[in-house]
């Protein structure tokens, strides 16, 4: 055997007498004409040898040590080679030791190639006899944090300060690569942290640092848990000791990333929590001890990852293969923080791609499942465009907006279906008609309906909104200048018996300038409240909007407005109000920023009320709001 | 008999290149270690740099380092050293030695040496 | 890097006598192998390099006994029993225990 190490390799190699054994016949290493039992070979040396005997492996090991320093210049990084190889060694037993020292603030992680790693404890061996043997250091004081076998859940082993890892190989195994590599890291402010994936069920068994004997005193060490999100977590302690704290107590702490109460902290003697979906981070947390009695802490524990118990397998197909443009997305609902541990709510895509939001898109038949303890705590958000970009292939055209029934079955309540209606600019307009007339919602009479559509400008420079409007009303129909979005937003789980209610067919008509068209037909004896588009905000600038109001042949309608003044103050041009009866063309004008809003007025005829707004200064908005009332023409009304 | 035969020596101007070469024979050439020596004109004995038999690891003397490539070409039984960005010091007797079989990095056989010259 | 020492660096004898040239290195050569990784080489005049000991006390092949070499860890001797006039040349000590491979600055012999 010839070993020869190169000069900067920083790496000893030393051949020693194994664990004895009741061989009667002595082995030696022969150097020429030396026999030797120990043999030290350092960076830059060569030496050839050989054995006296036939089968050194009985008889010696081999140990072959890489101190890496990262504390005088650049630490290599990057995938550990086994140097030298392993077939220019003699076939003994054999332990690679890598001696990695580094600045307190630096941060080293040990990244593990699948098969990953698999923690045992005193008194256990690997079947395949390949060990690896993990240690850091606290100042002076090396800190065990494990031997581990091959086939586990530990991918990353992160550490500061230093590390020292030992792959220990049997000469028979033929091994030619480390299966790890190392990188550097932002200092982790902890003793270690320790990362377990679980590519699907299985269990791990994990330990404090030190494992049996005590975990350093007041220290932190992390585990990271990577877990499909379709699976549950369970953990439970195995075997732990506390010790005598002086100061601080000592705990666990789990972070579940993109939960609201973390962290939620747990004493060691506490019921742990289980049926975690996805991710989460477990910590152990030591204290200050006594010094006369400090006793020891220590923790074994087990994570036992599988698919969640007591929960419907359910598929449920989206069929969205024959829609276009269309999204739909699946997510949390807003809800208050509180500090209680709160299992995972998920959505999985075939049953195995699981997350807290997941979007469908048009084109496709989606299969979708859910891992939540309450559905109520998702909601759905739909999102469909329709275009017309041809306005001779549009015009008269009519498209239904309606929820599609695969959409209502699902066991998630929809909030919002926005329909997003996109027409050639100054070529068409949009008329909306919905199956059953429609109430403006208004606080003096609010919509109580579990959905409303809410009709909204999307142009994006334009901040226009038309309003929020329900079934049950006297809004015949709305027609709208330009682009606009019409969402169904639905505001009690009702809605699924409501939805035959819903239904809006929405028309590409020849294009008009007015903003926005209202047809009203008021009920007999039912008083309709409208308002302005923009409540609250004020209408913009320029924008003028009508109101056809339909009267009946034996009614008499009242049109009262609520305010004596509109408040308007104008920067530039005027804003005014045109109410013009529609037989006769008889109309009268209002100047909105100097009149006082008519009193009072009865029409026997179909009128239109025309709002035109000038260029307001801020602050002084253009707010109207009136109503309309049917009376039968036989009432006196003086 | 084991021979080390040197060549490619010669005169060349402050920042140019140069192959050396030496021949083997008389010996399994791809099993030994070889090296390149040099001696300045009336000065001592300096090692350039080493290769291992089959090519996988060399060193070099620092003051060599990035300028001076060692190679080999066992199927030839030869080994090559390339020179470049060569300077004034770099003038000396180069010689090639192979490694003892035995431990260490002793020379057991040496070339007749071949002169590189760095003048301008 | 080690570095090795030579005294004395210039050693006129007589045909017959004895000489000695001490080799001091900076480190121990001694490994653990228990060899001293020390060798010792004659550069005739207008030739190259020959090994005469290697490993501290182990004479080449072809090299005359009057010839020998002592000495462990850092302080090391070449002898030659009786001077002869074919003996003339420079006489280097190398240390063989790691690269980079260093060597004496050479004791001349000369004869009286």
């Known amino acids: 055997f010839e070993i020869a190490l190169p000069r900067e390799s920083n790496i000893t190699v030393l051949i020693k007498l194994g664990t004895p054994t009741l061989l009667a016949k002595p082995c030696y290493i022969v150097i020429s004409k030396r026999h030797i039992t120990m043999l030290s070979i350092k960076s830059g040396e060569r030496i050839v040898f050989t054995f006296s005997c036939q089968s050194p492996e009985n008889h010696f090991v081999i140990e072959i040590q890489k101190n890496i320093d990262c504390m005088s210049g650049p630490c290599p990084f990057g995938e550990v080679q086994l140097q030298p190889s392993t077939s220019l060694l003699p076939t003994l037993n054999r332990t690679f030791i890598w001696d990695v020292k580094a600045h307190k603030s630096i941060g080293l992680e040990l990244q593990f190639s699948i098969p990953r790693l698999r923690q045992i404890g005193p008194g256990e061996s690997c079947p395949d006899g390949v060990t690896h043997s993990i240690s850091g250091r606290i100042d002076a004081t090396v800190v065990r944090i494990g031997t581990f076998c091959s086939n586990g859940t530990v991918s990353r082993i992160k550490m500061q300060e230093g590390v020292k890892m030992a792959l220990h190989l049997p000469w028979f195994h033929p091994r030619n690569v480390s299966g790890f590599s190392i990188a550097n890291r932002s200092s982790i402010k902890r003793l270690c942290i320790i990362e377990s994936v679980f590519e699907g069920e299985g269990s791990a068994t994990l330990m404090s640092a030190n494992y049996p004997e005590g975990f350093p005193e007041d220290e932190l060490m992390t585990w990271q848990f990577v877990v499909p999100a379709h699976l549950r977590a369970s953990v439970s302690f195995l075997n732990f000791n506390l010790s005598n704290c002086e100061r601080k107590e000592e705990r666990v702490e789990y972070y579940i990333p993109g939960s609201t109460t973390n962290p939620e902290v747990f004493k060691l003697e506490d019921k742990q929590p289980g049926n975690m979906a996805g991710n989460f981070n477990l910590s152990l947390q030591g204290c200050d001890q006594d010094a006369q009695s400090p006793g020891i802490l220590r923790l074994q524990f087990q994570v036992l990852v599988q698919h969640p118990q007591n929960e419907s397998n359910k598929i449920y197909v989206v069929d969205l293969s024959n829609e276009r443009a269309m999204s739909l997305t699946i997510e949390p609902r807003p809800v208050k923080q509180s500090r209680k541990f709160v299992p995972g709510c998920f959505v999985c895509l075939e049953s195995r791609t699981c997350s807290s939001n997941l979007t469908l898109t048009s084109g496709s038949k989606h299969k979708i499942s859910f891992l939540c303890d309450d559905l109520t705590r998702l909601w759905m958000n739909v999102e469909k465009t329709i275009s017309c970009t041809d306005h001779r292939y549009c015009q008269r055209k009519s498209y239904s907006l309606q929820v599609p029934s695969d959409i209502l079955h699902l066991p998630v309540e929809l909030h919002d279906f926005s329909w997003k209606l996109l027409v050639p600019k100054d070529r068409l307009s949009l008329v909306l008609v919905p199956a059953q007339k429609l109430q403006q919602h208004t606080h003096e009479k609010p919509c109580n309906t579990s959905f409303s559509y809410l009709v909204a400008s999307a142009i994006p420079s334009q901040d226009l909104y038309f309003g929020s409007f329900c079934p049950g009303g006297s809004i015949k129909q709305i027609q709208v200048k330009q682009n606009i979005s019409v969402t169904l937003r639905t505001f009690a789980p009702s809605f699924q018996q409501e939805a035959s209610r819903q239904g809006l067919t929405v028309s590409f008509i020849p294009y008009f300038k007015e903003e926005g068209v209202f047809t009203v037909t008021p009920d007999t004896k039912s008083k309709v409240y409208l308002r302005t588009p923009n409540w609250d905000r004020g209408l913009p600038s320029l924008t003028s909007v009508s109101w056809n109001i339909s009267v009946p042949r034996d009614q008499v309608a009242c049109l009262t407005f609520f305010k004596e003044r509109s408040g308007v103050v104008c920067q530039t041009g005027r804003a005014f109000m045109i109410i013009q009866e529609q037989r006769t063309r008889a109309e009268e004008i209002f100047s909105l920023d100097e009149d006082v809003l008519p009193k009072p007025s009865f029409h026997h005829h179909s009128f239109w009320v025309n709002i035109s707004n000038c260029s307001p200064t801020s602050g002084k908005q253009l707010d109207l709001l009136f109503s309309v009332t049917l009376t039968p023409r036989t009432v006196d009304l003086t | 008999e084991v021979q080390l035969v040197e060549s490619g020596g010669g005169l060349v101007q402050p920042g140019g290149s140069l192959r050396l070469s030496c021949a083997a024979s008389?010996?399994?050439?791809?099993?030994?270690?070889m090296n390149w020596v040099r001696q300045a004109p009336g000065k001592g004995l300096e090692w350039v740099a080493n290769i291992k038999q089959d090519g996988s690891e060399k060193d070099y003397v620092d003051s060599v380092k990035g300028r001076f490539t060692i190679s080999r070409d066992n199927a030839k039984n030869s080994l090559f050293l390339q020179m470049s960005s060569l300077r004034a010091e770099d003038t000396a007797v180069y010689y090639c030695a192979r490694v003892m079989y035995s431990s260490g990095w002793s020379f057991d056989y040496w070339g007749q040496g071949t002169l590189v010259t760095v003048s301008s | 890097d080690i570095v090795m020492t030579q005294s004395p660096l210039s050693l006129p004898v007589t045909p017959g006598e004895p000489a000695s040239i001490s080799c001091r290195s900076s480190r121990s050569l001694l490994h653990s192998s228990g060899y001293n990784f020390l060798d010792w080489f004659l550069q005739k005049p207008g030739q190259s390099p020959q090994l005469l000991i290697f490993?501290?006390?182990d004479r080449a092949s072809g090299v005359p006994d009057r010839f020998s070499g002592s000495g462990s860890g850092t302080d090391f001797t070449l002898k030659i029993s009786r001077v002869e006039t074919e003996d003339v040349g420079v006489y280097y000590c190398m240390q063989a225990l790691q690269t980079p491979i260093t060597f004496g600055q050479g004791t001349r012999l000369e004869i009286k």
């Open positions: 490993l501290g006390s």
């Open positions: 008389g010996f399994t050439f791809s099993r030994y270690w």
